[in-house]
């Protein structure tokens, strides 16, 4: 089959990191520089990614693959394959329009990236507040106010481990 | 050669909807974020949205936040604006730009009139 | 959206220097060394001039140079000539993905 197709279409024998050039009677050319060609018979090679302002060069183009990109220190990376560069906030805040803005009462952002969310209702799970929440941390929830009646135990010792297949010591 | 080749515009009534189209090539699509970006007859740029190479982060301008759907088919090299509510001043030729803003397509005109 | 404000007009005769300044604040172009500037003709797209406030993609003159101070940016071009008249606008990093453009200045060549 290989043979049957690379003489119907001599392109197919150009490798990586070359392009099957139909000026020149559809030779295989090298990709000229700062570009690429990552599988063989292409007709083109692709232009390099240029990791410039926010972003940082995390791997240098070659001919057969393209450049890879992260963000400068300050910044976090979004999508797959970091095309997008966003201020980092401190915790406790979330990126606006206007910058980095503290999280309203009620709510919290333990990372540099993201939106701050909503302190957990602690009373719709029936549970009381243990820790009251930051701006910087979710509340901690406690038993139930039931639980916590005189001569109750508040705190119930988790009971042993065991894991499939063994039997306890 | 990158090319960006922008179609869909036209003439539409206000509250009437456009779907504009990017093809892109010469360079690996599915790697960059996209933007559109437009401008208005003789005036100047504004910036409407952009999307991550996956689709997983969009951010619109305030002007046309709930009307404006920014997509993109990755394995069609192909980005979409999707207009609904149009209004007089959406008029604009509208281009679409790769990330950074190093390479634009010619554009395509909208014209919303009654 | 807030916007950078540019002097709406520029001029200057073949052989010298003009420079457009481009003002934003410190969430944008003083908070960054993010500013790009653009050349448009008429009835054409954009074309990325500078970026990085300083730095030119290949192809461009070296008579096209950037430079930051504060909030503001500058583009100057020097020996000027005819084919640089053109409308220009600068765009700034503003942290978050919401970019910024410049209100636009038309450059004559007298």
């Known amino acids: 089959f290989e043979r049957t197709r690379s003489l119907q279409d001599p392109c197919s024998n150009c490798p990586a990191g070359t392009f099957c050039d139909n000026n020149r009677n559809q030779i295989c050319s090298p990709c000229p520089p700062n570009s690429f060609s990552s599988a063989g018979g292409q007709r083109t090679c692709d232009i390099c990614r240029q990791c410039k302002g926010v972003f940082r060069t995390r791997k240098e183009c070659s001919s057969t693959s393209n450049a890879e990109c992260d963000c400068t220190p300050g910044f976090h990376c979004l999508g797959a394959g970091c095309s997008m560069c966003e201020q980092d906030c401190k915790q406790g805040q979330e990126l606006t329009k206007k910058g980095c803005k503290d999280c309203c009462f009620g709510t919290f952002n333990d990372q540099k990236r993201g939106i701050c969310r909503p302190w957990t209702n602690c009373s719709l799970d029936g549970k009381s507040v243990l820790v009251n929440g930051t701006k910087e941390r979710d509340v901690v929830c406690g038993p139930s106010p039931a639980d916590l009646s005189p001569g109750a135990s508040s705190v119930t010792p988790p009971a042993p481990a065991r894991e499939p297949g063994h039997s306890p010591q | 050669e990158v090319q960006l080749v922008e179609s869909g515009g036209g003439v539409v009534q206000p509250g009437g909807s456009l779907r504009l189209s990017c093809a892109a090539s010469?360079?690996?699509?599915?790697?960059?974020?996209m933007h559109w970006v437009r401008q208005a007859p003789d005036k100047g740029l504004e910036w409407v949205a952009i999307?991550?190479?996956?689709?997983?982060?969009?951010y619109y301008a305030d002007s046309v936040k709930g009307r404006f759907t920014i997509s993109r088919d990755n394995s069609k090299n192909t980005l979409f604006l999707q207009i609904n509510g149009l209004r007089a001043d959406d008029s604009a030729v509208y281009y679409c730009?790769?990330?950074?803003?190093?390479?634009w397509g010619q554009g395509t005109l909208v014209t919303v009139s009654s | 959206q807030s916007v950078l404000t540019q002097p709406p007009s520029a001029s200057g005769s073949p052989g010298q220097s003009v420079t457009i300044s481009c003002t934003g604040t410190?969430?944008?172009?003083?908070?960054?060394?993010?500013v790009s500037w653009f050349q448009q003709h008429p009835g054409k797209a954009p074309k990325l001039m500078i970026y990085?406030?300083?730095k030119r993609p290949s192809g461009v003159p070296d008579r096209f140079s950037g430079s930051k101070s504060g909030n503001t940016a500058s583009l100057t071009v020097s020996g000027l000539q005819a084919e640089d008249e053109a409308d220009y606008y600068c765009?700034?990093?503003?942290?978050?993905?919401?970019?910024?453009f410049g209100t636009g200045t038309k450059l004559t060549v007298l």
């Open positions: 730009a790769v990330h950074d803003f190093d390479f």
């Open positions: 010469g360079f690996t699509f599915r790697t960059y974020a």
């Open positions: 999307i991550s190479d996956d689709e997983t982060h969009k």
């Open positions: 410190n969430s944008d172009i003083g908070g960054y060394n993010y």
């Open positions: 990085d406030v300083n």
């Open positions: 765009s700034s990093f503003a942290g978050s993905n919401n970019s910024i």
